[in-house]
């Protein structure tokens, strides 16, 4: 079946700025028209596309949640970049929300890694040096990193 055989019977209503597809694909920052004849620009700050594509619509921009800071705004070619606020982090296995970092390590453990937007503080057993991955105790006890020096909070 040729494209001529399948010529569309109607044209889509005019929308944003248009250009022509290249080999049936539109460049980043655009989506394709229903009839495949035009590339239509995404709306700045509303939607985006990152790759050459033949999709009928651009992808909706992410809105940063409360508890997140916007590192960079949404453009027509790149989604918003959001990051957890200081003192909170987002884990890979629970990406839907920022969680508060622990303020210290359980008894018998020392802090070896700070709170970052991507990870909680990292604690290891004093003696063995193995990482702690268990739940935080009900009553969190801040332990000393070295004699007389309290473990530092997330920064």
């Amino acid at each position: 079946i040729t494209q001529q055989d399948l010529a569309p019977q109607q044209r889509a209503a005019p929308q944003q700025k248009r250009s022509s597809p290249s080999e049936g694909l539109c460049p980043p920052g655009h989506h394709i028209s229903e009839d495949g004849r035009d590339c239509i620009s995404c709306k700045y700050g509303q939607d985006y596309s990152t790759h050459w594509n033949d999709l009928l619509f651009c992808l909706r921009c992410t809105r940063c949640d409360s508890g997140e800071v916007e590192l960079s705004p949404c453009t027509t070619t790149r989604n918003t970049v959001c990051q957890c606020e200081e003192g909170t982090f987002r884990e890979e296995d629970s990406p839907e929300m920022c969680r508060k970092c622990r303020t210290g390590c359980p008894r018998g453990m020392v802090k070896v890694g700070d709170c970052t937007p991507w990870s909680d503080i990292e604690c290891v057993h004093k003696e063995s040096g193995t990482k702690h991955s268990g739940e935080v105790p009900a009553v969190e006890e801040t332990v000393t990193s070295s004699p007389g020096t309290p473990a530092s909070p997330c920064s």
């Epitope: 079946i1 494209q3 044209r11 049936g24 394709i32 229903e34 495949g36």
Partner: nanobody, 123 residues
Framework: EVQLLESGGGEVQPGGSLRLSCAAS????????MGWFRQAPGKEREFVSA????????YYAESVKGRFTISRDNAKNTVYLQMSSLRAEDTAVYYC????????????????WGQGTLVTVSS
């Protein structure tokens, strides 16, 4: 979850008519196309017709132009294929499918498929 339910298939004599329906649920895309494909025994699945939701752009395969008409009911999320002047070579299982790509007349451009409804044209 996208679900497509075809209906309206059956047996008809040459020159007769049938209307196929495809009801879609679970579609949350800003725009999409719904197409009809058919597959005769021992043959590859082939494009028949497609219609787009926002602009209403329509496509037909050359073999059905002037005999088949595709239409949509936006409120019901349903697409129809009115088939007339049916021929023995129109006998096939007719599938409804959904695409989020433009100018979608190839099978691989469709992401969601119905189970199909059988159309038999026989005297």
């Amino acid at each position: 979850e996208v679900q497509l339910l075809e209906s309206g298939g059956g047996e008809v004599q040459p020159g007769g008519s049938l209307r196929l329906s495809c009801a879609a649920s679970g579609l949350t895309f800003p725009n999409y196309g719904m197409g009809w494909f058919r597959q005769a025994p021992g043959k590859e699945r082939e494009f028949v017709s497609a219609i787009y939701w926002s602009g209403g752009t329509v496509y037909y395969a050359e073999s059905v132009k002037g005999r088949f008409t595709i239409s949509r009911d936006n409120a019901k999320n349903t697409v129809y294929l009115q088939m007339s002047s049916l021929r023995a070579e129109d006998t096939a299982v007719y599938y409804c499918a959904v695409t989020i790509r433009g100018a979608a007349t190839q099978t691989w451009k469709y992401d969601y498929w119905g189970q199909g409804t059988l159309v038999t044209v026989s005297s």
